[in-house]
């Protein structure tokens, strides 16, 4: 039995930041789980990990240097990413593993989300000047 994952097909990261919501066909309440976000068609880069084990507090980390945070819903985990670069535009896949209670469960590979990173340091057009930071 596999958990199904729904993601937005595409998101635009303005200001180098984005929120990506992973929706699962499984209630994570009172479960020990590891939710992760992976970059690339081959999911080669593990961008962010959100670990939950019954307590109220999620443990969030990245072994690949991404600035991330996570929020838990009953059947979702939202990944918040900051400081993205334009060249990190790519497809991102949500993954979920439920370790406890048995049986161990993971997900069918989702369709992924293309995150298009629009840099904030763009040259403003003369007709539409961008906001200036004080």
């Amino acid at each position: 039995n596999k958990i199904l994952v729904k993601q937005s097909p595409m998101l635009v990261a303005y200001d180098n930041a984005v929120n990506l919501s992973c929706k699962y066909s499984y209630n994570l309440f009172s479960r020990e789980f590891r939710a992760s976000l992976h970059k690339g068609l081959d999911s080669a880069v593990e961008v962010c990990v959100v670990y939950g084990n019954y307590s109220q507090q999620l443990q969030v980390y990245s072994k690949t240097g991404f600035n991330c945070d996570g929020k838990l819903g009953n059947e979702s985990v939202t990944f918040y990413l900051q400081n993205l670069y334009v060249n990190q535009t790519d497809i991102y896949f949500c993954k979920i593993e439920v370790m406890y209670p048995p049986p161990y469960l993971d997900n069918e590979k989702s369709n992924g989300t293309i995150i298009h990173v629009k840099g904030k340091h763009l040259c403003p057009s003369p007709l539409f000047p961008g906001p200036s930071k004080p």
């Epitope: 959100v50 109220q56 507090q57 999620l58 443990q59 969030v60 980390y61 990245s62 240097g65 991404f66 600035n67 991330c68 945070d69 996570g70 929020k71 838990l72 900051q82 400081n83 670069y85």
Partner: antibody
Framework: EVQLVESGGGLVQPGGSLRLSCAAS????????MHWVRQAPGKGLVWVSR????????SHADSVKGRFTISRDNAKNTLYLQVNGLRAEDTAVYYC?????????????WGQGTLVTVSS | EIVLTQSPATLSLSPGERATLSCRAS??????LAWYQQKPGQAPRLLIY???NRATGIPARFSGSGSGTDFTLTISSLEPEDFAVYYC?????????FGQGTKVEIK
């Protein structure tokens, strides 16, 4: 005026535990990410742990993962760091620091620190 | 993790002189670099954020510049109270990291 006041440090034996506290005032505590940063005697600054504004998520440096736990009580405007399995290399002044919830890891105000000494 | 290397380790100058402190990152941190001042027995104080923005209440003699991997903190004319240790810190990549510090001492 923003104030952060740490307490709970002291002398502890290797393997021992302490709970550090940071009492906050002068700002809306529940709107900010909070951090612990430490400084070994005569050394530089090292980030230890963070907690988001509502306490629902946390991150820890690899060197303390599994031993240190960060928490907060927004009703009491207090940040905590539970430190277990202390080692000699954890000897340091522990500072709590505030970070805006939009810039996560930019520390705009710091407490005066509390000294943790791990020695037998 | 990103390594920040500060130079020089110690800068010996007289009041009124210009101080130039360098911070180099092992990989690009965009403009997400801050500078802190720490005096003996005191907590660090934020001086500059996002490479070039002065924090609230910081005098105009402090300025920051740079992006990518190379950053500079300049104190245009040293005041007696500016003799301290200065740290750079990046928040572009997790985990956040600090440089080892530059001590500005009285010559």
């Amino acid at each position: 005026e923003v104030q952060l006041v740490e307490s709970g440090g002291g002398l502890v034996q290797p393997g021992g535990s302490l709970r550090l506290s940071c009492a906050a005032s002068g700002f809306t505590f529940s709107s900010y990410w909070m951090h612990w940063v430490r400084q070994a005697p005569g050394k530089g600054l090292v980030w230890v742990s963070r907690i988001n504004s509502d306490g629902s998520s946390a991150s820890h440096a690899d060197s303390v993962k599994g031993r240190f736990t960060i928490s907060r009580d927004n009703a009491k405007n207090t940040l905590y760091l539970q430190v277990n399995g202390l080692r000699a290399e954890d000897t340091a002044v522990y500072y709590c620091a505030r970070a805006d919830s939009s810039s996560w890891y930019e520390f705009d105000f710091w407490g005066q620190g509390t000294l943790v000494t791990v020695s037998s | 993790e990103i390594v920040l290397t500060q130079s020089p380790a110690t800068l010996s100058l007289s009041p009124g002189e210009r101080a130039t402190l360098s911070c180099r990152a092992s990989q690009s941190v965009s403009s997400y670099l801050a500078w802190y001042q720490q005096k003996p027995g005191q907590a660090p104080r934020l001086l500059i954020y996002d490479a070039s923005n002065r924090a609230t209440g910081i005098p105009a003699r402090f300025s920051g510049s740079g992006s990518g991997t190379d950053f500079t903190l300049t104190i245009s004319s040293l005041e007696p109270e500016d003799f301290a240790v200065y740290y750079c810190q990046q928040r572009n990549n997790w985990p956040p990291t600090f440089g080892q510090g530059t001590k500005v001492e009285i010559k």
